[in-house]
Interface confidence: low
Amino acid sequence: YNLDPQRPVHFQGPADSFFGYAVLEHFHDNTRWVLVGAPKADSKYSPSVKSPGAVFKCRVHTNPDRRCTELDMARGKNRGTSCGKTCREDRDDEWMGVSLARQPKADGRVLACAHRWKNIYYEADHILPHGFCYIIPSNLQAKGRTLIPCYEEYKKKYGEEHGSCQAGIAGFFTEELVVMGAPGSFYWAGTIKVLNLTDNTYLKLNDEVIMNRRYTYLGYAVTAGHFSHPSTIDVVGGAPQDKGIGKVYIFRADRRSGTLIKIFQASGKKMGSYFGSSLCAVDLNGDGLSDLLVGAPMFSEIRDEGQVTVYINRGNGALEEQLALTGDGAYNAHFGESIASLDDLDNDGFPDVAIGAPKEDDFAGAVYIYHGDAGGIVPQYSMKLSGQKINPVLRMFGQSISGGIDMDGNGYPDVTVGAFMSDSVVLLRARPVITVDVSIFLPGSINITAPQCHDGQQPVNCLNVTTCFSFHGKHVPGEIGLNYVLMADVAKKEKGQMPRVYFVLLGETMGQVTEKLQLTYMEETCRHYVAHVKRRVQDVISPIVFEAAYSLSEHVTGEEERELPPLTPVLRWKKGQKIAQKNQTVFERNCRSEDCAADLQLQGKLLLSSM
């Protein structure tokens, strides 16, 4: 709800390059970058290679033209370069930039992959689409490190083992592990390649049952998180073709044996839903353990609306399905094609997530924002970002999403979304969130036996009503304007009945008070009112509810940023509820005990008159 769709930072890539198929927010020292995968681009650094794809870096600040430049991966201009004893590379159509991931630390490196990279050493027998990944240094400058996790010397069979593994179709980076999905291994049973950077060894998946489930595409999506314990890292892999319905596995990375051991699995619910084709590990409820979101973008009630299943971690890797999210359930939306953790977008202490539906609105695309809370995830999305509304040129907006990094320096993480069919990427900046604390002070009860006020004609029962407001938040302005409406006896009004009390202000009677306040940061401002009780009130049992509804007035001032225009704050979302505060009081019952039971006796007599 606090992302600003009105001032998108738009980066445009080369035409028909699929620029935006993958996106990644990155920082090095004080520089913020949007990294973009364009897997069908030509590379200026390898002009003789046919459309190998490229990774572009787009500087966020001091880049008025929103220019993006290709990253030089120092891979040379030549074709057919030797890459091992029995390895010669063919980079034509390799799809560099199909996936991007960042190591989660200050000088974090970047993983960029090309899953269609081929080893053509055994050209006469088989062209082997092993897939290729590259670890790029944090400064995006120096030469990085090449990974071909499926290459093994003298192995030349296509389907067997890792011949056609296509590693890197998905990638994930932890502080120590590089996780690469390889869905083509073992006749497309698929596997996950996990490189431990500390000892430079690969963890192996030796689970025979999984390895023999051909054509399941394990590794089509990968992630990692703290599932079994807050201090251990476990690896997650999606197998979207498993039994036609899809499956997700969590593996413990066992350092001693150097293997991945299955600790959890869950299956999809509908044939062809592609359950497991997108994954997101995020601690939604702040308990130190990762929860899991699993996308099934082709889940259909009518056609491919898509669905995301949320699993909450109950400890020791035992995950419990909380609910399924569907966004707006739009026709052919592919909701769940991408899922990204956004860190704490609105500064409420819980992480938030974005879910892409890139085919919604006839391929324009949309992104939905959901919020974590103590119970897991808030089922109602707080915001829908429509590609069409952000910029009508956008196509497949939401195919890729990256978040969690404050790109504009206002203290809130921002969100970057790719729209590869229009070769576009959009950075959406987060607005500061204002929390308004509202108190309504009322008497414990209203004395209706001894009127304390006068309405100009006769004594009336009355009560004092005081409202107090203050506000706080991270990186919010020092002063704000607040519009508020104080309503009396709202429960009656909501039922279409006449309120029993009314305000008296400067001799005028009114059912509600509307005011505009100028508030200063962390300073309480109060207003005092007198409310009169109507004469001959019949209902003296039900409580009288007062409600203060409030909104920011137009003249809110945001802090100025140097390069990017300032964004004004928003009020904290109330999980879909009205932004208002209520309090209630009751009519004094004048009973000896609180439990006021009626002692009534009725006698009836039937009187009939003959006509």
Epitope: Q6, R66, R431, E479, T557, P565, L567
Partner: antibody, heavy 122, light 107 residues
């Protein structure tokens, strides 16, 4: 209604300084930005800078840093601009204009003063 | 600084004629554009903000459009009281910069 009343015309000698005032009424002075704009005969408009009276924060166009100083007196709801080391290049009409930062409106100047004519001549 | 280039510099139009003024920014200003009208001897008046939003009280014959770096303002049926100089201004980044102005007169 909102009004911005500027001080009268000034004839000043080169090298001197001048202080132009802009008295605001009809709105909350501390809640809006007060901008100053320069208009030379036959030329376009130039934004000099703004002051936010509520906090005293200022933002200047680099071109006018050291030339113009913006201040505000909240008790009298008056904004001031002092222009120093005057030369003939400073001869112009100077406007004050109200604006605010808003999600809907950005930095747009919705009310303007009537302008103060400054002539620098020996 | 963002440069704003306005055209034409001057224009004469008949009453009832449709007039279009254009403004080009040196970089994308993402709809953060205003149009102001300044009549002889008066202070400027805000007509259009956010590229296409009409300020309260401005006649509906004025309209704004555009995106990216190219923006325009249209006066649907020129009236004698529309004789003035019109300025565009970018509100995207500091320093806020104005176009050179278009002087519009009655033919």
């Amino acid at each position: 209604q909102v009004q911005l009343q500027q001080s009268g015309p000034e004839l000043v000698k080169p090298g001197a300084s001048v202080k132009i005032s802009c008295k605001a009424s009809g709105y909350s002075f501390t809640s809006y930005y007060m901008n100053w704009v320069k208009k030379r005969p036959g030329q376009g408009l130039e934004w000099i800078g703004w002051i936010f009276p509520g906090s005293g924060n200022t933002k200047y166009n680099e071109k006018f840093k050291g030339k113009a100083t913006l201040t505000a007196d909240t008790s009298s709801s008056t904004a001031y601009m002092q222009v120093s080391s005057l030369t003939s290049e400073d001869s112009a009409v100077y406007f004050c204009a109200r604006s605010w930062v808003s999600y809907e409106r950005g930095y747009y100047f919705d009310y303007w003063g009537q302008g103060t004519s400054l002539t620098v001549s020996s | 600084d963002i440069q704003m280039t306005q055209s034409p510099a001057s224009l004469a139009a008949s009453v009832g004629e449709t007039v279009t003024l254009t403004c080009r920014a040196s970089e994308n200003i993402y709809y953060s554009l205003a149009w102001y009208q300044q009549k002889q001897g008066k202070s400027p008046q805000l007509l259009i903000y956010n590229a296409n939003s009409l300020e309260d009280g401005v006649p509906s014959r004025f309209s704004g459009s555009g995106s990216g770096t190219q923006y325009s303002m249209k006066i649907n049926s020129m009236q004698p009281e529309d004789t003035a100089t019109y300025f565009c201004k970018q509100a995207y980044d500091v320093p806020y910069t104005f176009g050179g102005g278009t002087k519009l007169e009655i033919k």
